[in-house]
């Protein structure tokens, strides 16, 4: 039950996170005009990854797309790439995780397959979240650098009398949305990986019981392997998976490949 809850919660948190990453990527307010030195401006500038906008005090807003690819700063291109990779990985992760959900039955899909899918989606969410956080952080760093550079030559005097105020940009709402969304996706991914451990098929360990039945003596040995009955019908040791409910003392956890993430 706890595994299903962890997996479900991980899925929901990741879903919210990816929706946030998509929203942040599409938002125009990645950088907004810093009004500290010009609080009386009647024209407000803000920029996104795809276009820049100007909002006038009249309420009229005009946005212009960046219709060049080669003319854009490499950092902006890198941020775009990181956000898109984050979205793509997140979307694939969501698709995979839907089929991995314990509460959804698809044919005769084994728990091992679901565990693998849960782990895969979890890793995808983690990478997706990291991509978003990295993208937003790179953009934020770019803003900070430009902010202090423009502060250094804030006013360029013309003839000693006329002032040209250079527009400075500060963090926009999209950055905060991106950071939070990336964090949520990351957390969701970690939760999926944790859930995967619980979903991983466990080695069933039956207690050593020896009893005499009329006719043939059948011994059950510890280790979850069915011993030969002496009839020669089962010469290979096969793992027995018990899908049913077990009491706590019936279950013994063995390290599996899913334990080390």
């Amino acid at each position: 039950m706890a595994v299903t809850a962890c997996q479900g919660l991980g899925f929901v948190v990741s879903l919210i996170g990816i929706a946030g990453i998509i929203a942040a990527t599409c938002m125009d307010q990645w950088s907004t005009q810093d009004l500290y030195n010009n609080p009386v401006t009647a024209v407000f500038n803000y920029q996104g990854l795809w276009r820049s906008c100007v909002r006038e005090s009249s309420g009229f807003t005009e946005c212009r797309g960046y219709f060049t690819l080669l003319g854009l700063p490499a950092m902006l291109q890198a941020v775009r790439a990181l956000m898109i990779v984050g979205i793509v990985l997140g979307a694939i992760g969501l698709l995979v995780s839907i089929f991995a959900l314990k509460c959804i039955r698809i044919g005769s899909m084994e728990d091992s397959a679901k565990a693998n899918m849960t782990l895969t989606s979890g890793i995808m969410f983690i990478v997706s979240g990291l991509c978003a956080i990295a993208g937003v952080s790179v953009f934020a760093n770019m803003l900070v650098t430009n902010f202090w550079m423009s502060t250094a030559n804030m006013y360029t005097g013309m003839g000693g009398m006329v002032q040209t105020v250079q527009t400075r940009y500060t963090f926009g709402a999209a950055l905060f949305v991106g950071w939070v969304a990336g964090g949520l996706t990351l957390i969701g991914g970690v939760m999926m990986c944790i859930a995967c451990r619980g979903l991983a098929p466990e080695e069933t360990n039956y207690k050593a019981v020896s009893y005499h039945a009329s006719g043939h003596s059948v011994a059950y040995k510890p280790g979850g392997f069915k011993a030969s009955t002496g009839f020669g019908s089962n010469t290979k040791n096969k793992k027995i998976y018990d899908g049913g409910a077990r009491t706590e003392d019936e279950v013994q956890s063995y390290p599996s490949k899913h334990d080390y993430v």
């Epitope: 009647a42 820049s52 100007v54 005090s57 309420g59 009229f60 040209t164 527009t167």
Partner: antibody, heavy 118, light 113 residues
């Protein structure tokens, strides 16, 4: 067609207050910001303040803070400006105007003449 | 506050003449975000409210004759009337639309010779 109809001229005594109106028609009243401008006889133009009828957000010229108060009535599609503690310096024509592209004022009312005299 | 200085204060002209008036601002009116200059030109005839001619320094308002041309950038702006008509005799004001408070120039009065 956008039209702004302003109230009739006012003759008021010094120290009194006056409230003038600007009735908008030909468009959705909440769509455009309304600006108020002062013009003394034979002189230049002076921006007083604006009001956004959509949310009643206002922005005043520091010079007119405490002198002018802007309000609006959406149901009547009318903007109002009240001038208080009037002196002879307040004798002027007061215009209301709508704002759009480039923060410019494309549509103006005919003006309300306020004369402050004892 | 941004100070708008217009020159000349008055101009005596004849019909058909090319007229040029200037407007200087104490601060740049160029917005880097859209590379537009937030300067507006108005025409005011006696007993009438001002009429919008040009916004964004060079964009002509609809219905304004093409003999009116606005130019300039940053702090120096010009309004040109290519061939003056008798109905163009009026006072012309420039206005800063870039920062509050919006400020107007003192005007240029066109008079007939």
């Amino acid at each position: 067609e956008v039209q702004l109809q302003q109230s009739v001229p006012e003759l008021v005594k010094p120290g009194a207050s006056v409230r003038m109106s600007c009735k908008a028609s030909g468009y959705t009243f909440t769509k455009y910001i309304i600006q108020w401008v002062k013009q003394k006889p034979g002189q230049g133009l002076e921006w007083i303040a604006y009001i956004n009828p959509y949310n009643d957000d206002t922005k005043y010229n520091e010079k007119f803070k405490g002198k002018a108060t802007l309000t609006s009535d959406k149901s009547a599609s009318t903007a109002y400006m009240e001038l208080s503690s009037l002196t002879s310096e307040d004798s002027a024509v007061y215009y209301c105007a709508t704002t759009y592209y480039g923060n410019s004022f494309p549509n103006w009312g005919q003006g309300t003449l306020v004369t402050v005299s004892a | 506050d941004i100070v708008m200085t217009q020159s000349p204060s008055s101009l005596t002209v004849t019909a058909g003449e090319r007229v040029t008036m200037t407007c200087k601002s104490s601060q740049s009116l160029l917005n880097s975000g859209n590379q537009k200059n937030y300067l507006t030109w108005y025409q005011q005839k006696p007993g009438q409210p001002p009429k919008l001619l040009i916004y964004w320094a060079s964009t002509r308002e609809s219905g304004v004759p093409d003999r009116f041309t606005g130019s300039g950038s940053g702090t120096d702006f010009t309004l040109t009337i290519s061939s003056l008509q008798s109905e163009d005799l009026a006072v012309y004001f420039c206005q800063n639309d870039y920062s509050f408070p919006f400020t107007f120039g003192s005007g240029t009065k066109l008079e007939i010779k």
